[in-house]
Interface confidence: low
């Protein structure tokens, strides 16, 4: 009689993460008597996946009724596959004894797992930057398999070209990660802008994943100042206004100085928002001209978002 052969007909099986993998194994003879075991990997470090005789293998079920005496099909199904399950699986026939001894192994079936990439996470710079500066954004996605993946960057729907992408590891692995860094030049109109990282992978069936970052968290638009003298409201009184325009974010403190001495400090509160997302604010100072014998230098000093103060001055003429 011909010697028993262990046949694993599938050299490789590819399964999507979360699905079940069927690993086929048949033997050509009922002799010698003894159980079948499934292992992942070969050699002394191999991992037991299923033992026909004993043990608890909650994710493994036999495809046919392996308890039947004449059964020669020892195919198994492994449920809820994850990338960690990738590897080569061997169906091994043992000869009954005390203990059972390994008799013959199948050629092995390589299980590859198609795993979806995680949602891309986009992160921007730690500190805010001003228009005309170039800032870097990073995008990361993990846990996908196979390695082939494509990543694109967009700013407000326009594709970016200045970026570098790495897929790790370079060699074979159960799953992979992608890391990309894009450079974006800020403009004054970017408060409402978005940077999008788009990842396409075979497991996504043409529906890419996107991660976004709002440039409102990255940009600082410094204000422009204008100090003007308003018509006299009452005799001996002059109204001076400081218009603070086009700034972002809102955090702003204004100080009035009369001839270098602090007159009043206030924090921007009732601001008006421009279409581009920046803010405008106006502060006024009522100056009693009769209290001054000489000309008065009025300075509007603004500290925006913790940055060094900027100021604008106005000389108030005091007529004799």
């Amino acid at each position: 009689e011909e010697e028993l052969q262990v046949i694993q007909p599938d050299k490789s099986v590819s399964v999507a993460a979360g699905e079940s993998a069927i690993l086929h194994c048949t033997v050509t003879s009922l002799i010698p008597v003894g159980p079948i075991q499934w292992f992942r990997g070969a050699g002394p470090a191999r991992e037991l996946i299923y033992n026909q005789k004993e043990g608890h293998f909650p994710r493994v079920t036999t495809v046919s009724e392996s308890t039947k005496r004449e059964n020669m099909d020892f195919s198994i199904s492994i449920s809820n596959i994850t990338p960690a399950d990738a590897g080569t699986y061997y169906c091994v026939k043992f000869r009954k004894g005390s203990p059972d001894t390994e008799f013959k192994s199948g050629a092995g079936t390589e299980l590859s797992v198609r795993a979806k990439p995680s949602a891309p996470v986009v992160s921007g710079p730690a500190a805010r930057a001003t228009p005309q500066h170039t800032v870097s954004f990073t995008c990361e996605s993990h846990g996908f398999s196979p390695r082939d993946i494509t990543l694109k960057w967009f700013k407000n729907g326009n594709e970016l070209s200045d970026f570098q992408t790495n897929v790790d590891p370079v060699g074979e692995s159960v799953s992979y990660s992608i890391h990309s860094t894009a450079k974006v030049v800020l403009t004054r109109e970017d408060v409402h802008s978005q940077v999008i990282c788009e990842v396409a992978h075979v497991t996504l069936q043409g529906d890419p994943l996107r991660g976004t970052a709002n440039l409102s968290e990255t940009i600082r638009v410094p204000p422009t100042l204008e100090v003007t003298q308003q018509p006299v409201r009452a005799e001996n009184q002059v109204n001076v206004t400081c218009q603070v325009r086009k700034f972002y974010p809102q955090r702003l403190q204004l100080t009035w100085l009369e001839n270098g001495n602090v007159s009043r400090t206030e924090t921007a509160s009732t601001v008006t928002e421009n279409k581009d997302g920046t803010y405008n604010w106006m502060s006024w100072l009522l100056v009693n001209v009769s209290a001054h014998r000489d000309d008065v230098k009025l300075t509007c000093q603004v500290e925006h978002d913790g940055q060094p103060a900027v100021s604008k001055s106005h000389d108030l003429k005091v007529s004799a």
Epitope: K11, S12, S14, E110, S112, R114, P146, R147, D148, T150, L151, K152, S161, F163, Q164, T165, N166, V167, V170, S180, A200, V202
Partner: antibody
Framework: EVQLVESGGGLVQPGGSLRLSCAAS????????IHWVRQAPGKGLEWVAS????????YYADSVKGRFTISADTSKNTAYLQMNSLRAEDTAVYYC??????????????????????WGQGTLVTVSS | DIQMTQSPSSLSASVGDRVTITCRAS??????VAWYQQKPGKAPKLLIY???SLYSGVPSRFSGSRSGTDFTLTISSLQPEDFATYYC????????????FGQGTKVEIK
């Protein structure tokens, strides 16, 4: 050692069929694009079709679309080109080749910078009455 | 479809000559351009991948470069075994599923 061996070529009449095989060894075809490229006598190289068997990707040149079918049997580690409705202009040496990405990536075009690194010796298909 | 226009279609050169072959893409393309050498009755052999990377085992006299849509193969000092036909190739989609070849350049002995 990586090797590709084509077989199945021969003389066939116009309108006839032929199936070419590309037996791979030294690597698992599940993880690579396998391409068929042909070369008519005295002419240049013409790309025909490609398959990525793990996910059932198949692509064809316009000149063979609807007539040729590319496939792969991962258990045999073999790719196939089924050629139907053959014409005289299909006469050529047919090569199979492996496409490899070396891990380089072109960010602007979103393209892996790969190439056909291993080729078979070719099999001659002659379509003539 | 992207076309790869290769020039010249043939050239005559002597041993020791510097030889330059150009491929022009019909539109802006990625750097997924490769160069192959083919001798009569033999399969093509990969020389250059990713426009400028030298494939392992290929002599350093072969080099590739890119300028916009122009891709160039240069043989710095032609050797007797270099007389052959050379092809450029572009991998069109992001995983290299579609491929186009140039028409080929035959390098002959002067």
């Amino acid at each position: 050692e990586v090797q590709l061996v084509e077989s199945g070529g021969g003389l066939v009449q116009p309108g006839g069929s032929l199936r070419l095989s590309c037996a791979a060894s030294g690597f698992n075809i599940s993880y690579y694009f396998i391409h068929w490229v042909r070369q008519a006598p005295g002419k240049g190289l013409e790309w025909v079709a490609s398959v990525y068997s793990s996910f059932g990707y198949t692509y064809y040149a316009d000149s063979v679309k609807g007539r040729f079918t590319i496939s792969a049997d991962t258990s045999k580690n073999t790719a196939y080109l089924q050629m139907n409705s053959l014409r005289a202009e299909d006469t050529a040496v047919y090569y199979c080749a492996r496409f490899t990405f070396p891990g380089l990536f072109d960010g602007f075009f979103g393209a892996y910078l790969g190439s056909l690194d291993y080729w078979g010796q070719g099999t001659l298909v002659t379509v003539s009455s | 479809d992207i076309q790869m226009t290769q020039s010249p279609s043939s050239l005559s050169a002597s041993v020791g000559d510097r030889v330059t072959i150009t491929c022009r893409a019909s539109q802006s393309v990625s750097s997924a351009v490769a160069w192959y050498q083919q001798k009569p009755g033999k399969a093509p052999k990969l020389l250059i991948y990713s426009a400028s990377s030298l494939y392992s085992g290929v002599p350093s006299r072969f080099s590739g470069s890119r300028s916009g849509t122009d891709f160039t193969l240069t043989i710095s000092s032609l050797q007797p075994e270099d007389f052959a036909t050379y092809y450029c190739q572009q991998a069109v989609n992001w995983v290299g599923a579609l491929v186009t070849f140039g028409q080929g350049t035959k390098v002959e002995i002067k």
